[in-house]
């Protein structure tokens, strides 16, 4: 590692970002007293003056909701955070630069399975983001990613699964056994970006054949 | 007022290594990126790197990576370029640069020579 | 690498006259997020480490004086003295930060005619 820490008030300033949230977060060194308080400040790159975040001054959470401040996800992002406590001086700690666009993670999706006799449809929601667009409208993932897809799973059993993927939000595994457990999985890819979310999940069984 | 000073510069043999500070004052190193810059006699600029004093991470001009290498120690204020294997081009005055994109501070540059 | 080209090399000027500076750049220098173009302007005089007159292409540095302007999009951009002084003898250099690694231009020499 190329940089000595020995201040010990402050430690780990970094962005988690999943679906374009982007939040601000950061630990207290060994240091830190009760009465620490810290302060945020942000700014894009290139620009020369830090903006300081109404709400995350002199507070005492570790974290910092910094969504609107960021909501560009074509734009890189620093933010700072300055830590003061009785007796000492301030320390000041910034974060590598931030892309949401880059560094964001992709929640899984929100998804319906509806179960037939002999089928099971899974339906995908649209996930909003904080991102606007030019009209400022909330943008989808679909929206930001124009490469994203869904995989779909359907473990039949220990040894067989039925796969599907594409671009649409509806899809149906037909040929199914009524009367039977399924689980079902769905996951979001972005390939350009080499996204992947955790899978969303279901256990559905299928109806039971009346006729 | 923000300050940086440079020092460690001076004649090494080729193959030799240095290393260079950078003494920042009137604020934190920890607020803003450092950049080493360099700039052979007669000649123009040539920038090596970066570093977030902050966190550690480093860019570099692939032209120095594995030769030069960026740190910093946040208690002294200080950013440091270690160069290894010096060769007769590495001639210039090495300056350390303030900020992430373009360079609103710079130090008064310090001299390297390598001869034999 | 984007290479950054100068023009001219030097330039002689008599004091109170106009002296442009030209840079062109290898590839557009044009930041979509802000429409605004990654270009800085440095002076450098004798003995003295470059100092910061110009950033993003056209906005000026904290007390710089106004006969400094930059201008330009793209690919070609423009530093322009309006009436020389005898204080504004040095080398001028333009610099990129739209890539790593960030790049300058050879220097332009400004000298009184």
């Known amino acids: 590692h190329t940089t000595e820490d020995t201040s010990g008030l402050l430690r780990h300033v970094k962005f988690q970002s999943s679906n374009f949230e982007n939040i601000l977060t950061w630990d207290a060194g060994p240091a830190s007293a009760p009465d620490t308080v810290y302060s945020v400040e942000y700014k894009k790159y290139g620009e020369k003056e830090w903006l300081a975040k109404a709400g995350c001054q002199r507070i005492t959470q570790k974290f910092c909701n910094l969504t609107v401040e960021t909501r560009n996800h074509t734009e890189f992002y620093y933010a700072k955070v300055t830590a003061v406590s009785s007796g000492g001086p301030p320390v000041t700690k910034m974060t590598d630069r931030f892309s949401s666009l880059q560094h964001t993670t992709i929640r899984p999706p929100d998804v319906t399975c509806i179960p037939k006799v002999r089928s099971i449809q899974m339906l995908v929601h649209p996930t909003l983001t904080p991102v606007l667009s030019e009209d400022g409208h909330q943008l989808t993932l679909e929206e930001i990613f124009h490469d994203l897809f869904y995989r779909l799973k359907l473990h039949v059993n220990h040894t067989y699964q039925m796969n599907l993927e594409g671009k649409q939000r509806e899809y149906e595994f037909l040929g199914l056994t009524p009367d039977t457990e399924f689980l079902g999985s769905i996951t979001i890819l972005t390939p350009i970006l080499s996204k992947e979310s955790a899978p969303y999940t279901c256990r559905v069984k299928t109806l039971p054949d009346r006729t | 007022e923000v300050q940086l000073v440079e020092s460690g510069g001076g004649l090494v043999q080729p193959g030799g290594s240095l290393r260079l500070s950078c003494a920042a004052s009137?604020?934190?190193?920890?607020?803003?990126?450092m950049n080493w810059v360099r700039q052979a006699p007669g000649k123009g600029l040539e920038w090596i790197g970066e570093i977030n004093p902050s966190t550690g991470t480093t860019t570099y001009n692939q032209k120095f990576k594995g030769r030069f290498t960026i740190s910093v120690d946040q208690s002294k204020n200080t950013a440091y370029l270690q160069m290894n294997s010096l060769r007769a081009e590495d001639t210039a005055v090495y300056y350390c640069?303030?900020?992430?994109?373009?360079?609103?501070?710079w130090g008064q540059g310090t001299l390297v020579t390598v001869s034999s | 690498d984007i290479v950054m080209t100068q023009s001219p090399d030097s330039l002689a000027v008599s004091l109170g006259e106009r002296a442009t500076i030209n840079c062109k750049s290898s590839?557009?220098?044009?930041?979509?997020?802000?429409?605004?173009?990654?270009l800085a302007w440095y002076q450098q005089k004798p003995g003295q480490p470059p100092k910061l007159l110009i950033y993003w292409a056209s906005s000026r540095e904290s007390g710089v004086p106004d006969r400094f302007s930059g201008s330009g999009s793209g690919t070609d951009f423009t530093l322009t003295i309006s009436s020389l002084q005898a204080e504004d003898v040095a080398v001028y250099y333009c610099?990129?930060?739209?890539?790593?690694?960030?790049?300058f231009g050879q220097g332009t020499k400004v000298e009184i005619k």
């Open positions: 009137g604020y934190s190193i920890t607020a803003e990126y």
């Open positions: 590839q557009s220098l044009l930041y979509s997020s802000n429409q605004k173009n990654t």
């Open positions: 640069a303030r900020f992430d994109a373009y360079f609103d501070y």
């Open positions: 610099q990129q930060y739209y890539s790593y690694p960030f790049t």
